[in-house]
C-alpha cells in the first residue's frame, strides 16, 4: 500500500512472494527478496529490539536496489507484518506472515511479562487488547478478573483479529483489574500474557477559585484561596499556582480529592493556597492551574493588599439627587475601603431603618419617593477594624408635578347668577413652582350632550377644541390676574385667578399648570343661571359644630315649587382631562331635604338649616325651582365646605434674646386653629397690657417693646386659645446695660 506523496513517480517495491498473507510452520526458514528503483530497507515484527540476531538482511548478488530478508528456524513470535520500503518515503510493500506454532498460539510482546491497556469509560469507545495470533483462525475468548468473566466474539462489537487482537467495548471491562486472551486448540487451553486494565479520563470541566473576586486584605492577615477542579471520572490532577511572591516563606499548599456523591459522573479536586501574614509584595494576580496530562485549565483572581484598614468615599458619590414624586430613588454609597465598612444612613440627623418603603443598605432605596423625603441624607461609613468614620451628605430634592387642589377651586358644579362678576381660582402646588399657568375655555353646549359623542359619567365633556382665554369672542369677558404666591396649609402655592366680568354664557374653563416634571389641569363648570340664587348665612365657611343656613331666593312671579336637594357622591375626576358632570342635567343622584319657606314682597326664600354642622354635611347642595309659565326646571348648586375643628398651634418658636437698654424688641407669634384662636401675651405669668412702650398689633400677633428698660427683662409667654384648648410658647428676654437716670422719659409699664 502507498502512503504519502513522493516527489518522483516510483513503482512500489516488488516482493518475491506475491501474496498478502503467508502461512508457514514453525522451525522452517523464511526468505523474502525485495526489488525496487532506489535504496530499500526492511521492517519486520519486533525489529525494534536491536538484539535480534536471527534476522539477516543481505544485498542481492544480481542487481542494484535489491535486498533479501532471511530468518532460519522461525518461531510463533515471528508472526507479523514484513515491510519493504524506499528510504525516507512512505512507499512500501507489506506481507503478513503467520508462523503456525500450536504450542504458542499468541505472539508474546518483546519485553513485557504483562501488558497495560488504557481504557475510558465512554460507552461508545472500544479497546483493543493486543493479543495477536500466530494462527489466523483461532477460537479466542477474553477473560477478565476479578470477578471472573469471559467474553466471546459476537460478530458485532466483540471480535478477535489475529493481526490486531481482541476488540471489546471498553466499559465492559472497566471494572476489571486484568484481562488475558485464551485460545482452545484440540481441547488444550493457551493463554496470552496478562494485561493490566488502567481506566483513564482526562477532561477537566472547570477550575473555580474561591473567593472568586474582590479579595482584599490588610498587611499581616491570612490569605486562603481554594481552587476546585471538576473533572470526569478516572482523572488524576496536578495543581500548580502562580502568584506575585512565589518564594513566599509562609506559603502552604494542600491538595486533596473531594468526595462526590455516588452515581455522580464528576470528580472534584481541591488545592488550597494559604499565606500567613500577607505583605504588600503579595498583592497581585493569583492563578491556579489544574492539569490531567491531556487538558490544562486555569483561573485567576486579583488579591489586593492594603497597608492598613481604611475607608473613604469613592469619586462617584453624588451630592445632589433629583427625583419626581412616585419614582424609585437609589442613592448608592460609593466607597473605597478595607474591610468593607459598616454603612449607616441618617435623614436630617435621624437614623434611617429599613422597612417596606425604604431600604437603607449599601444603596439607600426609597421605593416611592414623596415630598416628605426631601432633605439632607447623611451616610456614615465606619471601618469595622479601625473605627475610622467618614461622612457624606446627599441632598435629595423631590419634584412634584403640578397638583391643583380641589378645595382651592370654586366648586366644579356651582351655578352662577347671570350678569354677576365671578372669580375662578386655580391653586397650584408644584415643585419647582409652575413655569406657567394657562387658562382655556369652551362653550358648555359645544362640549356637553352632543349625540355624536359617547358621554360617560367619568368623561361627560368630550371637549377637543379648547380656546385660549385671550380669545373670549362668543364667551364671557375675561381678565387673568397676575399669579399670587401664598402659604397654604404650610405649603408655598401659586394662585392663578380668572375674573369673569359678567356671567353671560355657560362655559367650561380649564387651568393648566406646567413645571419641569409634569403638568396638571382642572376643569371648572361655569353654569350661568337666571334662576334662583343661593346665599350662606352667616356668609362664611362654617366650622364643625357651628350652625349655618343655606338660603335659596327666587322671584315669586317667575318661579314656584322651590326644593332643596343634596347631591349624592359622584366619582371624582381622577385622570387629567376628565371633566365634572353638569349636575343640573343629571338629577338621578339628588336627595331631597327638609326646608322652611319664607316670603317677602317679591321673593320666596327656602331656608335649609344645618345645626351643629359636621364634616358629613359637606357637599353640593342643589336648589330646584320651576318656571311658572314654561314649567322648565332650573337648578342652582352651591358647594358647602365644613371646616374641621383644629386645636390651636403656634408656628415658629419664640427665641430667647438679649437686648441693650434703649433698643426695641419686636417679636411675632403666629397661631393657627379652627375656630381661630385668641392670642394673649404674659410677662412673668402676668397679662401684658398695652401702653406707650408696649404695642400689640395684628390681633396680638406682633409684640413691640420700644426703648426697653431693665424692668422689661423677664419670661414672655404667647398663648393662643380657643374652645378647643390653648397653646403657648415662651422666651426669656435679657436686658443689658446701665439704666440712664432721665426725666425726659417716664416710662411706666403696667404689669
Amino acid at each position: 500500500a502507498s502512503v504519502g506523496l513522493p516527489s518522483v513517480s516510483l513503482d512500489l517495491p516488488r516482493l518475491s512472494i506475491q501474496k498478502d498473507i503467508l502461512t508457514i510452520k514453525a522451525n522452517t526458514t523464511l526468505q523474502i527478496t525485495c526489488r525496487g528503483q532506489r535504496d530499500l530497507d526492511w521492517l519486520w515484527p519486533n525489529n525494534q529490539s536491536g538484539s535480534e540476531q536471527r534476522v539477516e538482511v543481505t544485498e542481492c548478488s544480481d542487481g542494484l536496489f535489491c535486498k533479501t530478508l532471511t530468518i532460519p528456524k522461525v518461531i510463533g513470535n515471528d508472526t507479523g507484518a514484513y515491510k519493504c520500503f524506499y528510504r525516507e518515503t512512505d512507499l512500501a510493500s507489506v506481507i503478513y506472515v503467520y508462523v503456525q506454532d500450536y504450542r504458542s498460539p499468541f505472539i508474546a510482546s518483546v519485553s513485557d511479562q504483562h501488558g497495560v491497556v488504557y481504557i475510558t469509560e465512554n460507552k461508545n469507545k472500544t479497546v483493543v487488547i493486543p493479543c495477536l495470533g500466530s494462527i489466523s483462525n483461532l477460537n479466542v475468548s477474553l477473560c477478565a478478573r476479578y470477578p471472573e468473566k469471559r467474553f466471546v466474539p459476537d460478530g458485532n462489537r466483540i471480535s478477535w483479529d489475529s493481526k490486531k487482537g481482541f476488540t471489546i467495548p471498553s466499559y465492559m471491562i472497566s471494572y476489571a483489574g486484568m484481562v488475558f486472551c485464551e485460545a482452545k486448540i484440540n481441547d488444550e487451553s493457551y493463554q496470552s500474557i496478562m494485561y493490566i486494565v488502567v481506566v483513564v479520563g482526562y477532561r477537566i470541566y472547570d477550575v473555580v477559585l474561591s473567593p472568586s473576586h474582590g479579595i482584599e486584605l490588610s498587611v499581616g492577615e491570612k490569605l486562603v484561596l481554594n481552587c476546585t477542579a471538576r473533572t470526569e471520572l478516572n482523572v488524576g490532577i496536578d495543581f500548580n499556582w502562580e502568584y506575585p511572591s512565589s518564594k513566599h516563606q509562609h506559603k502552604k499548599l494542600v491538595n486533596r480529592d473531594l468526595k462526590t456523591q455516588s452515581g455522580s459522573e464528576m470528580k472534584k479536586f481541591l488545592s488550597t493556597l494559604t499565606i500567613d501574614g500577607i505583605t504588600r509584595s503579595d498583592q497581585g494576580l493569583y492563578t491556579c492551574a489544574a492539569s490531567s496530562g491531556l487538558m490544562t485549565k486555569k483561573n485567576s483572581t486579583f488579591v489586593r493588599v492594603h497597608e492598613k484598614p481604611f475607608v473613604a468615599f469613592g469619586s462617584g458619590m453624588e451630592s445632589l439627587v433629583e427625583a419626581t414624586v412616585g419614582e424609585r430613588v437609589r442613592i448608592p454609597a460609593k466607597y473605597l475601603g478595607y474591610p468593607p465598612p459598616e454603612i449607616k444612613w441618617y435623614k436630617n440627623g435621624i437614623p434611617l431603618e429599613s422597612n417596606h418603603t425604604i431600604k437603607a443598605g449599601h444603596v439607600l432605596t426609597i421605593m416611592e419617593v414623596s415630598e416628605r423625603d426631601t432633605g439632607n441624607y447623611t451616610v456614615i461609613l465606619t471601618n469595622p477594624i479601625s473605627k475610622e468614620k467618614q461622612s457624606h451628605v446627599v441632598s435629595l430634592v423631590v419634584y412634584v408635578p403640578p397638583q391643583i387642589g380641589e378645595k382651592s377651586l370654586i366648586s366644579p358644579v356651582d351655578s352662577y347668577q347671570y350678569g354677576t362678576t365671578q372669580t375662578l381660582t386655580c391653586t397650584v402646588y408644584a415643585i419647582p413652582p409652575p413655569h406657567h399657568i394657562h387658562w382655556y375655555w369652551q362653550l358648555e353646549e359645544e362640549c356637553a350632550n352632543e349625540p355624536s359623542h359617547a358621554v360617560s359619567v367619568t368623561n361627560p365633556y368630550p371637549c377637543e377644541e379648547w380656546r385660549s382665554v385671550e380669545d373670549f369672542q362668543g364667551g364671557n369677558k375675561i381678565e387673568v390676574n397676575k399669579n399670587q404666591f401664598a402659604l397654604i396649609e404650610g405649603k408655598n402655592k401659586t394662585v392663578s385667578t380668572l375674573v369673569i366680568q359678567a356671567a353671560n354664557v355657560s362655559a367650561l374653563y380649564k387651568c393648566e399648570a406646567v413645571n419641569k416634571v409634569g403638568r396638571g389641569e382642572r376643569v371648572i363648570s361655569f353654569h350661568v343661571t337666571r334662576g334662583p340664587e343661593i346665599t350662606l348665612q352667616p356668609d362664611m365657611q362654617p366650622t364643625e359644630q357651628e350652625s349655618v343656613s343655606l338660603w335659596c331666593t327666587a322671584d315669586r312671579s317667575t318661579f314656584e315649587n322651590l326644593t332643596w336637594y343634596k347631591l349624592g357622591p359622584q366619582p371624582l375626576p381622577i385622570h387629567v382631562g376628565e371633566l365634572p358632570t353638569p349636575v343640573c342635567k343629571n338629577l338621578d343622584t339628588l336627595w331631597k331635604l327638609n326646608a322652611t319657606m319664607f316670603s317677602n314682597s317679591t321673593n320666596d326664600i327656602l331656608i335649609m338649616e344645618l345645626k351643629n354642622a359636621s364634616l358629613q354635611d359637606q357637599g353640593d347642595y342643589v336648589c330646584l325651582a320651576q318656571d311658572r309659565k314654561t314649567k322648565k326646571r332650573h337648578c342652582v348648586v352651591r358647594q358647602l365646605t365644613v371646616l374641621e375643628r383644629v386645636a390651636p398651634t403656634i408656628t415658629g418658636n419664640l427665641e430667647n434674646q438679649t437686648t441693650s437698654i434703649g433698643e426695641s424688641i419686636e417679636v411675632s407669634c403666629t397661631a393657627s386653629g379652627n375656630p381661630p384662636p385668641q392670642i394673649m401675651w404674659f410677662k412673668d405669668n402676668e397679662t401684658l397690657v398695652e401702653d406707650s412702650g408696649i404695642v400689640l398689633k395684628d390681633g396680638n400677633r406682633n409684640l413691640t417693646i420700644r426703648r426697653v428698660r431693665k424692668e422689661d427683662e423677664g419670661l414672655y409667654t404667647c398663648q393662643a386659645c380657643s374652645v378647643l384648648g390653648c397653646a403657648k410658647v415662651e422666651a426669656f428676654f435679657i436686658i443689658e446695660g446701665a439704666q440712664e437716670k432721665t426725666n425726659l422719659e417716664h416710662h411706666h409699664h403696667h404689669h
Epitope: 475510558t120 492551574a289 490544562t296
Partner: antibody, heavy 117, light 112 residues
Framework: EVQLVESGGGLVKPGGSLKLSCAAS????????MSWVRQTPGKRLEWVAS????????YYADSVKGRFTISRDNAKNTLYLQMNSLKAEDTAVYYC??????????WGQGTTLTVSS | DIVITQTPLSLPVTPGESVSISCRSS???????????LNWFLQRPGQSPQLLIY???TRASGVPDRFSGSGSGTDFTLKISRVEAEDVGVYYC?????????FGSGTKLEIK
C-alpha cells in the same frame, strides 16, 4: 514572547535511542500542560505524548507506548521525550506544543528525527 | 480511534476570493457539555502549525475575522473570506473529544 525551541533530533539506526528537549521561555512553564506532536514525511500530524503541569500524569499514542517517555523539569523550563527501540516509522519532525484547555496554542519550530539503517 | 477526513487535498485559489475547507469526523465531536471539540490549524510553508479556531467556531487570539468555523456534530467547515497571499499553507483539523486526539490529513491552499 512565548518561545519553544526543540533540540536533540538526528539520524538513528532502528532499535536505537534518542532524547529530545524543548526549552520554553516567555511564559510560566509550570502552569501549562505540554505535548509532543510529530509530522511524518508524508506531512501527516500525529499526537505522540502529553504531560501534566507537575509531571505526575502522562499519556502516549498507542504507536509509541512502552518505547517513549515524556518528562519535564519545571525548574529548567524544559520538556523532554526519551525515545527507545526506534523504528523507521518514527521518522518525523517532532514539535513540542504548549497546551491550555486541550488546545495546542503555541508550537516550537520542530526537530527532525530520521530512523534508518 | 476517531478518524478525521479532510477535503479537498489541494485547493488552488485566487487572492480575494472566498474558500471553504471541509472536515468530517467518524464520530460526533459534540460533547455532553454542549461544546464541539474541533480545532483548525494552519501550517505556513517552512513554519510550525498555528492554532486558528478552537471549539469549532472560536477564533484564537490574533486571528483575522476572515477566518470562520462552523459545522454540526460530524461535518465541519473552515471558511476563509477574501483570501490573502499570507493564507497559503496546509490547513489541518483536529478532534479533542476523545483520546487519542487525531488530526485530519491536511488541505493544501495555494495561490493559482
Amino acid at each position: 514572547e512565548v518561545q519553544l525551541v526543540e533540540s536533540g533530533g538526528g539520524l538513528v539506526k532502528p532499535g536505537g535511542s534518542l532524547k529530545l528537549s524543548c526549552a520554553a521561555s516567555g511564559f510560566t512553564f509550570s502552569m501549562y500542560g505540554m505535548s509532543w506532536v510529530r509530522q511524518t514525511p508524508g506531512k501527516r500530524l500525529e499526537w505522540v505524548a502529553s504531560i501534566s503541569i507537575g509531571g505526575s500524569y502522562t499519556y502516549y499514542a498507542d504507536s509509541v507506548k512502552g518505547r517513549f517517555t515524556i518528562s519535564r523539569d519545571n525548574a529548567k523550563n524544559t520538556l523532554y521525550l526519551q525515545m527507545n527501540s526506534l523504528k523507521a516509522e518514527d521518522t518525523a519532525v517532532y514539535y513540542c506544543a504548549r497546551e491550555l484547555d486541550g488546545n495546542y496554542d503555541y508550537w516550537g519550530q520542530g526537530t527532525t528525527l530520521t530512523v534508518s539503517s | 480511534d476517531i478518524v478525521i477526513t479532510q477535503t479537498p487535498l489541494s485547493l488552488p485559489v485566487t487572492p480575494g476570493e472566498s474558500v471553504s475547507i471541509s472536515c468530517r469526523s467518524s464520530k460526533s465531536l459534540l460533547y455532553k457539555d454542549g461544546k464541539t471539540y474541533l480545532n483548525w490549524f494552519l501550517q505556513r510553508p517552512g513554519q510550525s502549525p498555528q492554532l486558528l479556531i478552537y471549539l469549532m467556531s472560536t477564533r484564537a487570539s490574533g486571528v483575522p475575522d476572515r477566518f470562520s468555523g462552523s459545522g454540526s456534530g460530524t461535518d465541519f467547515t473552515l471558511k476563509i473570506s477574501r483570501v490573502e497571499a499570507e493564507d497559503v499553507g496546509v490547513y489541518y483539523c483536529q478532534q479533542l473529544v476523545e483520546y487519542p486526539f487525531t488530526f485530519g490529513s491536511g488541505t493544501k491552499l495555494e495561490i493559482k
